[in-house]
Interface confidence: medium
């Protein structure tokens, strides 16, 4: 099944988001993915958690993931890198590189994202894109076009109260509010876009969606760039 | 619960045959490669043979110490997981592991073993 | 055959020293999809293998993070940071990059 947790989003205007990636499984999606090098796409370590020995291939240039449409194109991974200290058992870490068979051919529908480097929090309040072909409602619709959301990023002390997320948040991760509109299953490993910069890889725990109390959480990329760039290199 | 239970082992003598048996239970079998590893009396570990699952066609993969004479096959609808051990010999003698392949390619999750014993 | 050579065969440690053990591959284990598949396996007496470090120096679940990998290439090194009554028994590495895949002969983590 689809690993994560958009509900309360909307259609996603096609190709407007050529860094969008939806990581398959046996030809079925698993998880959302980020574009992040010609070669690269950067996910959530938990996505290959039940992969077993499937085959993992990265879907670039979609739109719809059943319709023909020219600039799709799917790729089938080279290698997979798991954060060093990535584990089953925790939201840390949940961090993922996909190297492609070959580089992308890129295009208007198929380009890299720009990463945040700069190991800062973004303010609470700013809104980010968040978007994938995660379901759309509690009973677990599948989209067949790639949807998105516009969620307020949350303070981190917030996030931390007992009520919500309990400390679990640490300065590595980051939060959105979740009030009705969030990311849900199938979203995890997608990207959190904010001003244009990739800022944060919905984490894969299987937290409840939609609910104001248990807010999306997300890795920050800026976080992780000294062990992402030892990956690209 | 994830468990890997195998049966199937005992006393056979040089030359003789055994079908070593393994029943998978707790995870989606037909989805993971499968392993069987032995360990001589009182010795290390021995990578014995490897399965792929249906969507890698099944390809198999054996130690040189036992190419020819072994072979490896499950059965997914059973979730079971077989050795066929043809012309043993004194050296085959050991306790054999059932063990699961993650994606990432380690072995994480063992049988406790069956143990086989081949002396005239 | 990819001969992977443990060393030391014994370890004799006292309770909350760091021990390290070495594990040498007699050719190059990175696969050819770049990934290295190196991992090393803790065996208590009686009782099955378990997976402790996977990919050189990805700690597997539940390990205690007083366990880490490290090397590349053909020299690798796992590390316990304070060992533990509970850490005893023997540790083998295991190249899975080139078949047949093999084990190392096994480094026994005793009391001193």
């Known amino acids: 099944p689809p690993r994560g947790r958009i509900l309360g989003g909307r259609e996603a205007e096609a190709h407007a988001r050529p860094y969008m990636a939806s990581v398959q499984l046996n030809g079925a999606h698993l998880c959302g993915g980020v574009l992040v090098a010609e070669q690269w796409v950067l996910s959530a370590a938990h996505c290959l958690e039940d992969a077993a020995d499937g085959k993992v291939q990265v879907l670039l240039g979609a739109h719809s993931l059943s319709q023909p449409e020219p600039s799709k194109r799917l790729y089938d991974v080279l290698r997979a890198v798991p954060h060093p200290d990535s584990q089953p058992d925790t939201i840390d870490h949940d961090l993922l590189l996909l190297q492609l068979s070959e580089k992308a051919t890129l295009g208007p529908a198929v380009r890299p994202l720009p990463w945040q480097r700069v190991d800062r929090d973004v303010a609470p309040g700013t809104l980010c894109d968040v978007a994938g072909w995660g379901i759309v409602n509690h009973a677990g619709r599948r989209p067949d076009s790639l949807q998105h959301v516009l969620l307020p990023v949350l303070d981190r002390a917030t996030c931390n109260r007992r009520t919500h997320h309990d400390g679990a948040i640490t300065e590595r991760l980051m939060c959105a509010e979740s009030n009705r509109r969030d990311s849900c299953k199938g979203d995890s490993g997608g990207p959190l876009v904010c001003g244009g910069v990739l800022e944060g890889v919905v984490t894969s725990g299987s937290r409840v969606c939609g609910n104001r109390k248990k807010p999306g959480i997300y890795t920050r990329v800026a976080s992780y760039a000294a062990w992402i760039d030892s990956v690209l290199a | 619960e994830v468990q890997l239970v195998e049966s199937g082992g005992g006393l056979v003598q040089p030359k003789g045959s055994l079908k070593l048996s393994c029943a998978a239970s707790?995870?989606?079998?037909?989805?993971?490669?499968m392993n069987w590893v032995r360990q001589a009396p009182g010795k290390g570990l021995e990578w014995v043979a490897r399965?792929?699952?249906?969507?890698?066609?099944?390809?198999?993969h054996y130690a040189d110490s036992v190419k020819d004479r072994f072979t490896i096959s499950r059965d997914d609808s059973e979730s079971m997981l077989y050795l066929q051990m043809n012309n043993l010999k004194t050296e085959d003698t050991a306790m054999y592991y059932c063990?699961?392949?993650?994606?990432?390619?380690?072995?994480?999750?063992w049988g406790t073993g069956t143990t086989v014993t081949v002396s005239s | 055959d990819v001969l992977m050579t443990q060393t030391p065969l014994s370890l004799p440690v006292s309770l909350g020293d760091q021990a390290s053990i070495s594990c040498r591959s007699s050719?190059?284990?990175?696969?050819?999809?770049?990934?290295?598949?190196l991992e090393w396996y803790l065996q208590k007496p009686g009782q099955s293998p378990k997976l402790l470090i996977y990919?050189?120096?990805n700690r597997f679940s539940g390990v205690p993070d007083r366990f880490s990998g490290s090397g590349s290439g053909t020299d690798f090194t796992l590390k316990i940071s304070r060992v533990e009554a509970e850490d005893l028994g023997v540790y083998y590495c295991?190249?899975?990059?080139?078949?047949?895949?093999?084990f190392g002969g096994g480094t026994k983590l005793e009391i001193k």
């Open positions: 707790g995870f989606s079998f037909n989805t993971y490669a």
């Open positions: 295991f190249q899975g990059s080139h078949v047949p895949w093999t």
């Open positions: 050719q190059s284990i990175v696969h050819s999809n770049g990934n290295t598949y």
């Open positions: 990919t050189v120096s």
């Open positions: 063990v699961r392949q993650g994606y990432y390619w380690y072995f994480d999750v």
């Open positions: 399965i792929r699952s249906k969507s890698n066609n099944y390809a198999t």
